[in-house]
């Protein structure tokens, strides 16, 4: 077995980090392929091991547990396939960021003929994500997802108000979020479950 | 505006004890691997501690292992470094730093407090 | 410890480009991405130039730049000032845990 190139890895800046590793040839992962991985700087850091699973027939991933990592961590990886080591690297989870999805997406009717989408971010007070992250909120018709719009939340509350005129009336609607870190380097979250609503407003007398 | 501010250097005989301290501020210090540097009169610098964010990790430089602990507070957002057996070449000068990044990346220092020691 | 080797000296003209050196082993510069670059003006805290051989730190200008080859790391001031003479140091990881640090080079501008 060989290892093709470097693995790809993030981390959810929270709990895990996840690698995968492309391989030359088919592979069980978990009854082949060992990673050890363990924080470095510190001599009497905790040596831990991640039992990868196959993402593909030639694919591993390995999902590793980094509880409350923060920016000045690095982990020395080592990944085994029985007394041979395959792959030596480092990986720091400030590095490559991948927040977790943003949940419970809901839609609130608003007094003055708008929308308020609301959703939840998932890091408590004390990750740096807490007030880091931006939003992404795509908003397609159900029926075509090719006629979108999209909206840029840059500011840290997560909601985002929008006229209900700016969408037709008489059309179902489909809005998802992802969030991304502005201050560490990484790549947008998975998109949010989306939620489908109606979009129903009477138009004024001119327009009918 | 991140400040690091040490005390509680001074004049010590050989053999004897001290504990200098480092008060943080302007920043999320529970976030944040810290160190001490030292650097001896008309000397270079010096590597002597680290200490993991959450502060159960700790690492030493060989010439103070035994002798130095390292320790924080994040309740007080406080650095400390508790050196006893003080030798003669532990006289120098000793900063406070803060990590960021790896851990050779030291991107805010204190002022320093002096600690001689001599008989 | 044994340090990473630094030249105790180098000068360069105004304007001019100068490199200072940091030699070490497999274990330490040749085996990391850690290495950073501190100056140190006198009766002053060092303050940080460059972390992980290469990333400008925050307000540093271009001017400065680091690099590594094998077992050496290498800081390069182009453009160089008066205001640059000072005391350049660099830090290394070394596979033991520790850190070390060259034993500092004084920049003079000629």
């Known amino acids: 077995i060989k290892v093709l190139g470097e693995p790809t890895c993030f981390s959810d800046y929270i709990r895990t980090s996840t690698c995968e590793w492309f391989l030359d040839s088919a592979v069980d992962c978990s009854s082949q392929l060992c990673l050890h991985y363990r924080l470095m700087f510190f001599e009497f850091s905790e040596n831990l091991t991640c039992i990868p699973r196959n993402s593909a027939s030639t694919v591993c991933v390995c999902h590793m547990e980094m509880n409350r990592p923060v920016q000045s961590d690095r982990y020395q990886m080592e990944l085994w396939a029985e007394h041979r080591q395959l792959w030596q690297g480092s990986f720091s989870p400030s590095g490559n960021v991948k927040p977790l999805a943003p949940d419970n997406l809901t839609l609130h009717t608003n007094v003055s003929d708008e929308w308020l989408l609301t959703w939840n971010n998932l890091y408590p007070s004390n990750n740096l994500l807490y007030k880091d992250l931006i939003s992404m909120v795509n908003i397609s018709r159900e029926d075509n997802p090719a006629e979108f719009i999209v909206y840029n939340v840059t500011y840290k509350e997560p909601r985002l108000s929008f006229p209900i005129n700016i969408l037709m009336s008489g059309v179902y609607y489909t809005a998802r979020v992802r969030v991304r870190s502005q201050i560490l380097t990484g790549t947008w979250s998975e998109w949010s479950p989306s939620i489908t609503w109606y979009n129903h407003f009477q138009l004024p007398l001119i327009q009918r | 505006e991140v400040q690091l501010v040490e005390s509680g250097g001074g004049l010590v005989q050989p053999g004897g004890s001290l504990r200098v301290s480092c008060a943080a501020s302007?920043?999320?210090?529970?976030?944040?691997?810290m160190a001490w540097v030292r650097q001896a009169p008309g000397k270079g610098l010096e590597w002597v501690s680290h200490?993991?964010?959450?502060?159960?990790?700790?690492q030493y430089a060989d010439s103070v292992k035994g002798r130095f602990t390292i320790s924080r507070d994040n309740a007080k957002s406080t650095l400390y470094l508790q050196m006893n057996s003080l030798k003669p070449e532990d006289t120098a000068l000793y900063y406070c730093?803060?990590?960021?990044?790896?851990?050779?990346?030291?991107?805010?220092w204190g002022q320093g407090t002096q600690v001689s020691v001599s008989s | 410890h044994s340090a990473v080797t630094q030249p105790p000296s180098v000068s360069g003209s105004p304007g001019k480009t100068v490199t200072i050196s940091c030699a070490g082993t497999?274990?330490?510069?040749?085996?990391?991405?850690?290495v950073s670059w501190y100056q140190q003006f006198p009766g002053t805290a060092p303050k940080l130039l460059i972390y992980e051989v290469n990333k400008r730190a925050s307000g540093i200008p271009d001017r400065f730049s680091g690099s590594k080859s094998g077992n050496t790391a290498s800081l390069s001031i182009s453009g160089l000032q008066s205001e640059d003479e000072a005391d350049y140091y660099c830090?290394?990881?070394?596979?033991?845990?520790?850190?070390?640090f060259g034993g500092g080079t004084h920049l003079t501008v000629l």
């Open positions: 200490i993991h964010a959450g502060g159960s990790l700790t």
């Open positions: 730093v803060r990590i960021y990044g790896d851990a050779t990346s030291y991107d805010y």
């Open positions: 497999s274990s330490d510069i040749g085996g990391y991405n850690y």
């Open positions: 830090a290394s990881y070394r596979s033991n845990n520790n850190i070390v």
């Open positions: 302007g920043f999320t210090f529970s976030s944040y691997y």
